[in-house]
């Protein structure tokens, strides 16, 4: 016999669920243990059955879920998923804001990332604040010089991608750079994404040479400066 | 070629229903907002609704909230617009446009592309 | 929402000449990350709208030069230095700032 456990907890790191109105959610609480474990939902520490919810919802047991579709403000609370079996019990608590704001293009922190100076070998971070109603996607995109040019025949930047991410919104999303050399100097922009538009800001990342060892003992592996 | 074609209009009562498709190629659809605009005969342009490029989000003008679902399938490359309790004055050309894309915009991010659109009449 | 006031309704013009579209938005569509999201769209008879002028000021691939767009956060101008007859059609702006996305009500131009 076993105790109740999540199978993926991984897929439960998403706490605050924050939805625009008019969207479907879906809580998971996918969960093992012997005897198989039962599943109930509560909201605001009540039995959740949706029995006053227009449209009702769905659970699916079988699944470890609950959906609710066409959301509204009066959904807005704390789900709880209740596991049990004979041996014990697990809960695990979702907050769920239903947003009627009007949905912009997001909304990058004035001065993120920042201009950034570096010794080769140090490590940097070069830090992206990101608002935004609907849940952003972000990436990090470094400009490159491709035949020796940094521009296309169109007039647009040669970038690579370096890293892209699906974040909360308002997040800090970095960007790490290790062990940098004189290579990773250059252009770097934070580009966030919803459905409404783009929005992007560039910062600058000057790598210096390696100083004297006995000056670098004493300095901060990286200097910023805007 | 870019290309968005607009299919499902057609002639419906109100309170009936209808449901509009968007076959899209020439772009990777999966990596695209997509947005249904509607132009009434004679005027001007109204935009419906918004849907993210993994459809995880959904927005809708006031006036269809409700009454319309936006959805889409990435492996199909196809746009959707479910229309229920149809009105007299949901009459009008629906236009899928391109939205906004995942990376670095090489031009607009969105709104370059529209459909040549599909026409919806409600009438009794 | 934001309310997008174009001016004139309509316009003839004789082919040669210039002519100018004005566009106001109730709020400024200066973003922060500089860019002032208004668009120019040009629909001809018949068929959907195409995109003119992006961010403000940016043509559209394919676009003729004589199309330019200006102004700054709340006031908007589309201009035609030398309008030919293949221009006519109804001009729209559109703000692309924030949902709900809302378009001006349309500017007719015609040949004199």
């Known amino acids: 016999q076993q105790a109740p456990y999540w199978t993926h907890p991984q897929r439960m790191e998403k706490k605050l669920h924050a939805v625009p109105a008019g969207n479907t959610v879906k809580f998971r609480c996918p969960a093992a243990g012997n005897p198989t474990p039962t599943i109930r939902w509560l909201k605001d520490g009540q039995a959740f059955h949706g029995e006053n919810r227009i449209g009702g919802i769905r659970l699916r047991h079988q699944h470890w879920s609950l959906v609710m579709e066409s959301v509204v403000p009066s959904d807005r609370g704390t789900y709880t998923c209740l596991v049990e079996n004979a041996v014990g019990s697990i809960r695990y608590n979702y907050l769920l804001d239903v947003l009627e704001r009007s949905p912009h293009r997001p909304i990058l922190q004035a001065g993120l990332p920042a201009n950034t100076t570096a010794v080769v070998g140090s490590d940097v971070e070069l830090l992206c604040k990101v608002y935004s109603d609907a849940q952003p996607h972000i990436q990090w995109l470094k400009h490159i010089v491709i035949n020796g040019s940094s521009f296309g025949a169109d007039g647009f930047p040669y970038v690579q991608v370096l890293k892209t991410a699906d974040i909360n919104s308002s997040e800090v999303e970095v960007l790490y750079l290790r062990n940098v050399s004189a290579e990773d100097a250059g252009e770097y922009t934070c580009l966030a994404g919803n459905s409404i538009g783009l929005s992007y800001q560039s910062a600058w990342l000057t790598v210096l040479p390696e100083e004297d060892p006995t000056w670098t003992a004493a300095a901060p592996e990286a200097r910023y400066t805007d | 070629e870019v290309q968005l074609l607009e299919s499902g209009g057609g002639v419906v009562q109100p309170g009936r229903s209808l449901r509009l498709s968007c076959a899209a190629s020439?772009?990777?659809?999966?990596?695209?907002?997509m947005h249904w605009v509607r132009q009434a005969p004679g005027k001007g342009l109204e935009w419906v609704a918004v849907i993210s490029y993994d459809g995880s989000n959904k927005y809708y003008a006031d006036s269809v909230k409700g009454r319309f679902t936006i959805s889409r399938d990435n492996s199909k490359n196809t746009l959707s617009l479910q229309m229920n309790s149809l009105r007299v004055e949901d009459t009008a050309i629906y236009y899928c446009?391109?939205?906004?894309?995942?990376?670095?915009?090489?031009?607009?991010?969105?709104?370059?592309?529209w459909g040549q659109g599909t026409m919806v009449t409600v009438s009794s | 929402d934001i309310v997008m006031t174009q001016t004139p309704l309509s316009l003839s013009v004789t082919p040669g000449q210039p002519a100018s579209i004005s566009c106001k938005s109730s709020?400024?569509?200066?973003?922060?990350?500089?860019?002032?999201?208004v668009y120019w769209y040009v629909q001809k008879s018949g068929q959907p709208p195409q995109l003119l002028i992006y961010?403000?000021?940016n043509r559209f691939s394919g676009v003729p030069d004589r199309f330019s767009g200006s102004g700054s956060r709340t006031d908007f101008t589309l201009k035609i230095s030398r309008v030919e007859a293949e221009d006519v059609g109804v001009y729209y702006c559109m703000q692309y700032i924030e949902a709900p996305l809302t378009f001006g009500g349309g500017t007719k131009v015609e040949i004199k």
């Open positions: 709020r400024s569509l200066l973003h922060s990350d500089g860019k002032t999201y």
């Open positions: 020439g772009f990777t659809f999966s990596s695209y907002a």
């Open positions: 446009v391109r939205g906004a894309g995942r990376g670095f915009p090489y031009g607009p991010d969105g709104f370059d592309i």
């Open positions: 961010e403000l000021s």
